[in-house]
Structure formats: structure tokens, C-alpha cells
């Protein structure tokens, strides 16, 4: 069913409802060279065949050139994220040319009409690039197209139509409706640039997915699984953002891609890393924290160029705001026996103690179920850099702490009144840091005491063999 939109109607209605009463529209695409970090400055307008503005506005032919391409608009004005991105690019690449592609008149339409206009806008950008290529020292390899939502597909068209190959296209949550499953020439795809990297932040497997779910680049990064973004829940939105409606939740999650990219520009000392994985569930299990064979990468501007034979889906967790970086850990817990488990899955928490800091109490998400006589893998992440890990506290939540478990406990008791206490035996926990790729084994403090039961805790310290390093590379940041 479609995503509800409260009293304002459904999302589909919003997609097809123009905000403005329109008189005759001059179909237009403008290229605004942002000449100043001051967001209020009017900038310079470039047009094909007119070289004077290039000279007047000090267009740097040898520098990087960014084209920022907005998406569909309900208001007809530039959204506030655009100025953040312009400012971040100016901060990071002081000599670069930052060009805003203004296609507001063609984007401020019914969603379906705006989609149909993307091809025209792509052609306009390609013509501008073809003209710039005629100038000495201008290289298409220095061109980086950054498209948000519908703008990502505009970038794809531009890359497809231009004579030659642009250096890079970044798709920031490319639009989903009317593009999901489309032919590669009718959407952003890997052959539109030398390197196409994509951030997916609003994908939904139910209802209407605002962002495209399918991978469309050389690397496709799905922060927090590509769907529910921290800090964008209805409660968060009610407290901080205008409206506080489901509309704003959608906007928050969709726009998160832009903020992750901005974060990568302004907080390059705090890079976020994504890890290759076949799907979100496997990532949540902690299986995919390897950096071998290019299996991890920085996200956003600092992403290393990877031209894979097929799309590479990558995942990571993030904080709710800038800086978005978190520290990922894979925890392998070998359960060698358990007693009287019944039908209740245990609820485990870990606290990590490090040389720099201690973590909060972190839940171990059981994606499927705890397996006996097997190694169970979990993903945990912390917002702070703990340094080298020293010890781990594992806690089994008591049944009374969870109403759901209390009910299951009661049902279990009714069926087996003399059910003795449940117990699990764990000798060691193996931990791998995603960010450093270091592996460490932790053993129980008391080798004789390896059992844990509801409401109890078990302490683990670094085993005597200390750090165990495999021949794996850590995700070093290679700046573009």
C-alpha cells in the first residue's frame, strides 16, 4: 500500500500535484557558477557560446568542476541542502568551479512531467560540457556531476550524451518512481561516467520507494540498510524539523544522502567506511566487515574509484547527525552448549571497554536465532573511538525486563511447570574491528565459569595470545 500522508493525502497525490499556478513557462536550464562562499551572492550565469562570463567570473579551466543537479521540487525554490553542499565543496576544493544546474522551471511540475524533462536537462548539461571541452586545458576527467534524487538520473543522461566520458557521477539517493527496473539508458548506470558512486538512503520494500532500490553505480552504498535513517523517526522530526509530519520523515531520510556527502567533504578526518555485502540482513549479522579485495571503501567524496565487473552493494551504520562516522565491530560468539532454552530467544547486551573510552550498553541483534554448538556472529557499533579493546561485559537480559519475553516465559512455564533455569555456555568472543581490521580474542575471566543465564553477566578479557592479525588491509583513506 502507498505511504500515507496524513491529512494532506497520499504520497502519490503529492507526486502529481504542482504547487504553483503557472503561466507560460520558458523551458530553461541555467548554469550558475557559484563564485563566492557567500550563499546570498547571485553568482555568474554561464551559457554555451559565451566566453566572457568564464573570464569575468574566473572559471578555472584546469581545476575540478562540480555540477550540482537538484531534483523534483514542490516549492519552485532551491532547497536548503543546496547551499550546504555548495559551501562544503568550496571549503574542501578551494580552486574548484562549482556550478549549480538550475532546472527549477522544468522540475516544478507534476512528478511525471519532471521525469520526462530529465532527458532534456541531461542534454543541456552535455551541450555545456561539449562546449567547455573546446576550451584549452578543460578536461572531462575533472568533471564531477553530483545529482540528488531526480537530479541523479539527469546526471546519468548528461554522462550518456556528452562526447567523451565524465570523470565521476555521484548519485545522492537517486529517484525511484518511474526508474526502478528501467533500462540502463533511461536511468543512472555505471557506463555514464568513469566512476559512478551512489548513496541510497530512502529505499522501501513496501509502499512507494522514493529512492531507487536497485544498484545503479559501480558502488552502491546503503547506509543503515538504505531505509530507516537514525534521527529521522517521527519523534525526532517532531522535535527538531519544521512540520513534524510523515512528509518530513520522508524528506529527512531522502535528504540524508546529501548530508552524508557533505559530511565526507567537511569531516575528512572522520571518514565513514562501508563494507561490501550481498544484502542488509547479512550485514546486520556482522558477516561483512572485510576490507580484502576492495571489499570496503570510504563513502561520499573520499570514495576510492572501483570499477567492478558488476555492481558492488555496500553497507554501513551511521550516527543520527554529523559527523556520521561510527565504529563497526564483528562479534563472534561460540555457544558450545545451552540448557532449557524453550522458545525464547535470549536478549544479549555487550559493553566494550577500551583504552580511549567505554561504550554504552549495546544490544546484540539476533537476526535469526542463536545456534548451539556453532559460532554466532553479531554486528555492534559505537559512536566513539574506544581505542584498543581491553574487556567485554556480556549481559543476558532478565525475562522481566521485557514484557514480550515475560509473556513467553509465562507460556513456557504453563507448558513445562518444572522447567529448570535456562543457561548458556560461552568460552570466548572473537572481535574484529571494521575500521582497523584488527582481530582480537576475548576469554572468560574465570575459565571455570563460562555459563550465563537471564539477569546475569559474564566478563571477558583479552586472551593471552593477544592481537591476532590476518593479512588484511585496513581501510585507509585515499583522497581523490
Amino acid at each position: 500500500s502507498p505511504v500515507p500522508f496524513g491529512p494532506e493525502g497520499r504520497l502519490e497525490d503529492k507526486l502529481h500535484k504542482p504547487k504553483a499556478t503557472q503561466t507560460e513557462v520558458k523551458p530553461s536550464v541555467r548554469f550558475n557558477l557559484r563564485t563566492s562562499k557567500d550563499p546570498e551572492h547571485e553568482g555568474c550565469y554561464l551559457s554555451v557560446g559565451h566566453s566572457q562570463p568564464l573570464e569575468d567570473c574566473s572559471f578555472n579551466m584546469t581545476a575540478k568542476t562540480f555540477f550540482i543537479i537538484h531534483g523534483w521540487t514542490m516549492s519552485g525554490i532551491f532547497e536548503n541542502w543546496l547551499h550546504k553542499l555548495v559551501s562544503a565543496l568550496h571549503t574542501r576544493e578551494k580552486d574548484a568551479n562549482v556550478v549549480v544546474v538550475d532546472w527549477l522551471p522544468l522540475a516544478h511540475q507534476l512528478y511525471t512531467d519532471a521525469v520526462n524533462n530529465t532527458r532534456v536537462v541531461g542534454h543541456s548539461i552535455a551541450r555545456m560540457l561539449d562546449w567547455l571541452q573546446e576550451k584549452d586545458d578543460f578536461s572531462l576527467g575533472n568533471v564531477h556531476l553530483i545529482g540528488y534524487s531526480l537530479g541523479a538520473h539527469v546526471a546519468g543522461y548528461a554522462g550518456n550524451f556528452v562526447k567523451g566520458t565524465v570523470g565521476r557521477i555521484t548519485g545522492l539517493d537517486p529517484a525511484g518512481p518511474m526508474f526502478e527496473g528501467a533500462d540502463i539508458h533511461k536511468r543512472l548506470s555505471p557506463d555514464d561516467a568513469d566512476f559512478v558512486d551512489v548513496l541510497h538512503t530512502y529505499t522501501r520494500s513496501f509502499g512507494l520507494s522514493i529512492g531507487i532500490q536497485m544498484p545503479v553505480g559501480h558502488i552502491d552504498i546503503y547506509p543503515n540498510g538504505g531505509d530507516f535513517q537514525p534521527g529521522c523517526g517521527l519523534n525526532d522530526v517532531l522535535g527538531s524539523i519544521a512540520y513534524g509530519t510523515i512528509t518530513e520523515v520522508v524528506k529527512c531520510e531522502h535528504e540524508r544522502a546529501v548530508h552524508l556527502f557533505v559530511d565526507s567533504l567537511v569531516n575528512q578526518d572522520k571518514p565513514s567506511f562501508a563494507f561490501q555485502c550481498t544484502d542488509s540482513n547479512r550485514f546486520k549479522k556482522g558477516i561483512c566487515l572485510s576490507c580484502r579485495k576492495n571489499r570496503c571503501n570510504s563513502i561520499g567524496y573520499n570514495a576510492k574509484k572501483m570499477r567492478n565487473k558488476r555492481n558492488s552493494k555496500m553497507y554501513l551504520k551511521t550516527r543520527a547527525g554529523m559527523p556520521f562516522r561510527v565504529y563497526h565491530y564483528q562479534m563472534k560468539i561460540h555457544v558450545f552448549s545451552y540448557k532449557n532454552m524453550g522458545e525464547i530467544e535470549p536478549t544479549f547486551y555487550v559493553t566494550l571497554y577500551g583504552t580511549n573510552a567505554d561504550s554504552q550498553t549495546l544490544p546484540l541483534e539476533i537476526v535469526e536465532r542463536i545456534e548451539q554448538n556453532a559460532t554466532n556472529t553479531f554486528l555492534v557499533y559505537t559512536e566513539e573511538d574506544l581505542g584498543d579493546l581491553l574487556k567485554i561485559q556480556l549481559t543476558w537480559e532478565g525475562a522481566s525486563q521485557s514484557w514480550y519475553n515475560l509473556w513467553k516465559e509465562f507460556r513456557s512455564y504453563l507448558s513445562q511447570p518444572r522447567n529448570p533455569g535456562r543457561e548458556l555456555n560461552i568460552r570466548r568472543i572473537r572481535v574484529k574491528s571494521g575500521e582497523t581490521q584488527r582481530k582480537l580474542t576475548f576469554c572468560t575471566e574465570d575459565p571455570e565459569n563460562t555459563s550465563i543465564s537471564p539477569g546475569r553477566e559474564l566478563w571477558f578479557r583479552k586472551c593471552r595470545d593477544g592481537w591476532r592479525m590476518k593479512n588484511e588491509t585496513s581501510p585507509t583513506v585515499e583522497l581523490p
Epitope: 513557462v25 550558475n32 547571485e42 516549492s75 543546496l82 550546504k84 522551471p105 527538531s240
Partner: antibody, heavy 120, light 111 residues
């Protein structure tokens, strides 16, 4: 210097229409949007809408939809606001004010205002 | 639409006084670290004039005795030492979303 020059005062009968002009000078007309704001006697400021001077696309405030038309003539750098089916409560000073397409979109330059009196 | 409530609606003050006017928005007018709140001065029979933009930035040609502060939903315009030419009506305005809206105004009169 940057300025917006508005047309002179108008006296209209209820049901009639009025068209106010705003001629811009000292800057590139199409590089800024044009807003229209009105102020009834002794009252506050009320935004009526704005027009993208490059594309000619207007956006109207809900209270004025269907009754107002905003247009531009880029050859003379002039913006126009026409209000139809005038009522006595449309008696006000009508201002044009420019705002940037970029940044925080405040109204940095205002016309002196055009007084429109609606009286039978 | 975002509602802006100014207080007081009018005040009487003397030359040299410190004057503070507040503006409260019905919801946040911040985007990241930017505030989309602005202040205008209007004298009788004249057009409004931009005083402060983005909560705290002084517009070109505006004397330094005017200052703005605040974030989120609460904003303040301060005149550190009131001058004879400052007797006017002051309006706050938000532009974080269309429609832009104005506060009801604060009339500063001579005591």
C-alpha cells in the same frame, strides 16, 4: 544603485482590477526573484506571492490564488502584479521586493509602495 | 504555514535605552546551523528596510547598535542604545519555507 520603482497610486471600484508595475534597475533583473507584499492601513505585512523572473513561473499565496496574476517583461526589467475582483479590504499599500534565488532568500530591496484604494 | 509571534506589540522607550524585541516561531526555522529568520524596520509612510538577516547578520549600512540573536524558534532583536531615528515598527520574517511569513510587528514609540 539598485532600486525598484513602482507605479503611482490607484483608486478602484469594488469588482474592478488593478495592475501595479515595478521597474528594476541597478542589477540583472533575471538574477533575483520578485515578491509582492501588501500592507492594509494600520496592519502588518502580508506576502502575496513571487515570480521567478527568469522562467516566468509565479507562485501565489493560498489566499490570493485565482485572483492574482504575476508577470514580468524581461526586456524592460519590469514585474507586474494584477489583482482582480477587488474588495474594500484590498485597500492597502502594495510593495514589490526582490529576493535571491540562493541562500536564505530574505527581501533585501523594496519598492516605495503603491497605494491602492478600493471604494465605491 | 509557520506563525511568528512578536512581543511586545508596542513599547515606549527613551533615547539611550536598551530595547529588546522577541519573535517566536511556531516551529523551528533552522536548517543545520543556519537560521532563516530576518528583521525589518518600517517607518510611517515608508517601505520596510532589511536590518538583520539570518538571525544575527547586520545588513549593509545598518548601524552596529542593532543586533540579532537566537536559533530554532526563539529570536531577539536588540537595540543597544536607542536613537531618535530608531522610533519605528519592527517585523521579523521567516524564509525557511514558502510562504514566507511575517510577525505582527512591534511599534517602538517615544516615552
Amino acid at each position: 544603485q539598485v532600486q525598484l520603482v513602482q507605479s503611482g497610486a490607484e483608486v478602484k471600484k469594488p469588482g474592478a482590477s488593478v495592475k501595479v508595475s515595478c521597474k528594476a534597475s541597478g542589477y540583472t533583473f533575471t538574477n533575483y526573484g520578485m515578491n509582492w507584499v501588501r500592507q492594509a492601513p494600520g496592519q502588518g505585512l502580508e506576502w502575496m506571492g513571487w515570480i521567478n523572473t527568469y522562467s516566468g513561473v509565479p507562485t501565489y499565496a493560498g489566499d490570493f490564488k485565482g485572483r492574482v496574476t504575476m508577470t514580468t517583461d524581461t526586456s524592460t526589467s519590469t514585474a507586474y502584479m494584477e489583482l482582480r475582483s477587488l474588495r474594500s479590504d484590498d485597500t492597502a499599500v502594495y510593495y514589490c521586493a526582490r529576493r535571491g534565488y540562493y541562500g536564505r532568500r530574505y527581501f533585501d530591496v523594496w519598492g516605495k509602495g503603491t497605494t491602492v484604494t478600493v471604494s465605491s | 504555514d509557520i506563525q511568528l509571534t512578536q512581543s511586545p506589540s508596542s513599547l515606549s522607550a527613551s533615547v539611550g535605552d536598551r530595547v529588546t524585541i522577541t519573535c517566536k516561531a511556531s516551529q523551528s526555522v533552522d536548517y543545520d546551523v543556519d537560521s532563516y529568520m530576518h528583521w525589518y524596520q518600517q517607518k510611517p509612510g515608508k517601505a520596510p528596510k532589511l536590518l538583520i538577516y539570518a538571525a544575527s547578520n547586520l545588513a549593509s549600512g545598518v548601524p552596529s547598535r542593532f543586533s540579532g540573536s537566537g536559533s530554532g524558534t526563539d529570536f531577539t532583536l536588540t537595540i543597544s542604545s536607542l536613537q531618535p531615528e530608531d522610533f519605528a515598527t519592527y517585523y521579523c520574517q521567516q524564509t525557511i519555507e514558502d510562504p514566507p511569513t511575517f510577525g505582527g510587528g512591534t511599534k517602538v514609540e517615544i516615552k
